[in-house]
């Protein structure tokens, strides 16, 4: 078996972590964000060829059934594995608060 | 904002459970799964468009993202958001074996 | 290098006023948040409030809201912490400590300022 | 009476292995994160850990980090005798955002 993060098509060509640098009004928050204005979003973007970085059994069956029925079934989708936790001072009807998000920027990727 | 179960581009072009029938031999088990012969694989296929089925934050932020950067970012993807236990029998040196795999066949799905 | 610099240790009276300060260094000042934390003596950390630099927010801890006020002046990179009428009960080690890219942990601290009240 | 409980003390010698409990709920370490600091005498705290498990640059792969329901552990392997010090588990708790166990004294015996 191909080692799973090796990626086939070239480096940096595969599922992995980027960072795409973000402004409030990119994200949409800036009616409801005062901080921080700026974020590093780091997400999981990249091709998910054969054997690489596959999450789970179900990944593993979904290649070969694309590979079978490319028209019906698409490949593996390049996914966050788990995330970084993230806080942000958010405006409220009183003033500001602090709420602490656990979904917002993935920490490693995976296909599925 | 939208219903996040509304398919804005027509019924059943959006991310949702589909059912493809696949034998041993589709999906690269026949030198290990006795049975069963055919299994009805559950997965999720189709769209992400904008707000439908967003599993977290996370899902918002690379819609806002794709539309500004389409060509850097992708949109979000359809994977499963929970998988349906499943039993095999499969060869083992000494004979046979059950075994359950707990993340063969997706249950529901959802856009990341 | 990332550097925090407090201003040095400080005797009060009760019901005096007191402001301490935290510079920071190495780093883009408006970029990262920075807190507070209190240690009485012989005892643990307790997180008092925070400040975005940049937009000078401030959050306080339940405890201590009212109680001290924070502020920032970015020209100069410093944060600030403030007492308009100390107590006995203030006397403690009073930590600045820069907030990580996620806002979530203290990646840099300050090396602490001790305020002593007492009659 | 802190939100997230450490015990008081623990001791090893050098060489040992020593694990530091953190316990919270299910408002705090449960859904969220865990930080550890160490704060050797007569000085501030420095990071040890963030996010569950993760090290910063210079500190040794002695020190690891885990979670496990509304648990959180760190574990030092190799005990040495600067390892002595103030360990303090931090997360966050809705109410009164971010919070501190109490604070665990680590003696390296001998």
């Known amino acids: 078996a191909r080692n799973g993060d090796r990626c086939p098509l070239g480096p940096g060509r595969c599922c992995r972590l980027h960072t795409v640098h973000a402004s409030l009004e990119d994200l949409g928050w800036a009616d409801w964000v005062l901080s921080p204005r700026e974020v590093q979003v780091t997400m999981c973007i990249g091709a998910c060829p054969s054997q690489f970085r596959e999450a789970n059994m179900h990944a593993q069956i979904k290649m070969n059934l694309h590979r079978l029925k490319p028209d019906t079934v698409p490949a593996p989708c390049c996914v966050p594995a788990s995330y970084n936790p993230m806080v942000l001072i958010q405006k409220t009807d009183t003033g500001v608060s602090l709420q602490t998000y656990d979904d917002l920027l993935a920490k490693d990727c995976h296909c599925v | 904002a939208r219903n996040g179960d509304r398919c804005p581009l027509g019924p059943g072009r959006c991310c949702r459970l589909h059912t493809v029938h696949a034998s041993l031999e589709d999906l690269g088990w026949a030198d290990w799964v006795l049975s069963p012969r055919e299994v009805q694989v559950t997965m999720c296929i189709g769209a992400c468009p904008s707000q439908f089925r967003e599993a977290n934050m996370h899902a918002q932020i690379k819609m806002n993202l794709h539309r500004l950067k389409p060509d850097t970012v992708p949109a979000p993807c359809c994977v499963p958001a929970s998988y349906n236990p499943m039993v095999l029998i499969q060869k083992t040196d000494t004979g046979v074996s059950l075994q359950t795999y707990d993340d063969l066949l997706a249950k529901d799905c959802h856009c990341v | 290098e990332v550097q925090l610099v407090q201003s040095g240790a400080e005797v009060k009276k009760p019901g005096e006023s007191l402001k301490i300060s935290c510079k920071g260094s190495?780093?883009?000042?408006?970029?990262?948040?920075i807190g507070w934390v209190r240690q009485m003596p012989g005892k643990g950390l307790e997180w008092m409030g925070v400040?975005?630099?940049?937009?000078?927010?401030?959050i306080y801890s339940p405890s201590f809201q009212g109680q001290v006020t924070i502020s920032a002046d970015k020209s100069i990179s410093t944060a600030y912490l403030q007492w308009s009428s100390l107590k006995a009960s203030d006397t403690a080690m009073y930590y600045c400590?820069?907030?990580?890219?996620?806002?979530?942990?203290?990646?840099?601290w300050g090396q602490g300022t001790l305020v002593t009240v007492s009659s | 009476q802190s939100v997230l409980t450490q015990p008081p003390s623990v001791s090893g010698a050098p060489g040992q292995r020593v694990t530091i409990s953190c316990s919270g709920s299910?408002?705090?370490?449960?859904?969220?994160?865990v930080n550890w600091y160490q704060q050797l005498p007569g000085t501030a705290p420095k990071l040890l850990i963030y996010?569950?498990?993760n090290r910063p640059s210079g500190v040794p792969d002695r020190f690891s980090g885990s979670k496990s329901g509304t648990s959180a552990s760190l574990a030092i392997t190799g005990l040495q005798a600067e390892d002595e010090a103030d360990y303090y588990c931090?997360?966050?708790?809705?109410?009164?955002?971010?919070?501190f166990g109490g604070g665990t004294k680590l003696t390296v015996l001998g």
């Open positions: 400590a820069r907030y990580g890219r996620y806002g979530t942990y203290f990646d840099y």
């Open positions: 190495g780093y883009s000042f408006t970029s990262y948040w």
């Open positions: 400040i975005d630099p940049g937009g000078s927010y401030t």
């Open positions: 299910s408002s705090n370490i449960g859904v969220l994160y």
């Open positions: 996010s569950n498990d």
């Open positions: 931090q997360s966050w708790d809705s109410s009164s955002n971010y919070v």
